[in-house]
């Protein structure tokens, strides 16, 4: 579910609120060249939201995007 044309982007801060799962369309991971690890969620309204990959909800959403039927 990871876009082939992944943008080069970094997260400098993370969202402080959990996004409703049904708002999420896709995600990509930030580059190792970034100063901090990050996940960027793409919403169904084409917004990009930086999230902290150490948060459980972020991990669950990412996992569900790819492995849940």
């Amino acid at each position: 579910s990871l876009a082939a044309d992944t943008p080069t982007a970094c997260c400098f801060s993370y969202t402080s609120r959990q996004i409703p799962q049904n708002f999420i369309a896709d995600y990509f991971e930030t580059s190792s060249q970034c100063s901090k690890p990050g996940v960027i969620f793409l919403t169904k309204r084409s917004r990009q939201v930086c999230a902290d990959p150490s948060e459980e909800w972020v991990q669950k959403y990412v996992s569900d995007l790819e492995l849940s039927a």
Epitope: E29, T30, S31, S32, P37, G38, V39, P53, S54, E56, V58, Q59, K60, V62, S63
Partner: nanobody, 113 residues
Framework: EVQLVESGGGLVQPGGSLRLSCAAS????????MRWYRQAPGEQRELVAD???????NYRDSVKGRFTISRDNAKNTVYLQMNSLKPEDTAVYYC???????WGQGTQVTVSS
Amino acid sequence: EVQLVESGGGLVQPGGSLRLSCAASGIITSRYLMRWYRQAPGEQRELVADITSGGSTNYRDSVKGRFTISRDNAKNTVYLQMNSLKPEDTAVYYCKALGFDRWGQGTQVTVSS
């Protein structure tokens, strides 16, 4: 710097078992979504299983009931127990941590009689 070292692969007969290990440094595996991928010759890399920091696990349909992902926090290591192996499980297996685009060298699993 994040480093992931996979091991435990080998040649096994159909129906056999293997346990793969992913030893991590530069990252605390218990804090991140840890994932096992595999890549067969001429195929794209595919996600096999993952485990969240809270211990929730997910599997691709073709390995459900046969593979089990787990983690040893004290050893900072993630495992993939593979049972009832099939020829179609033949691939190089890699582990990865969500948010870190670092890959190890992988470990080869060959299922053949």
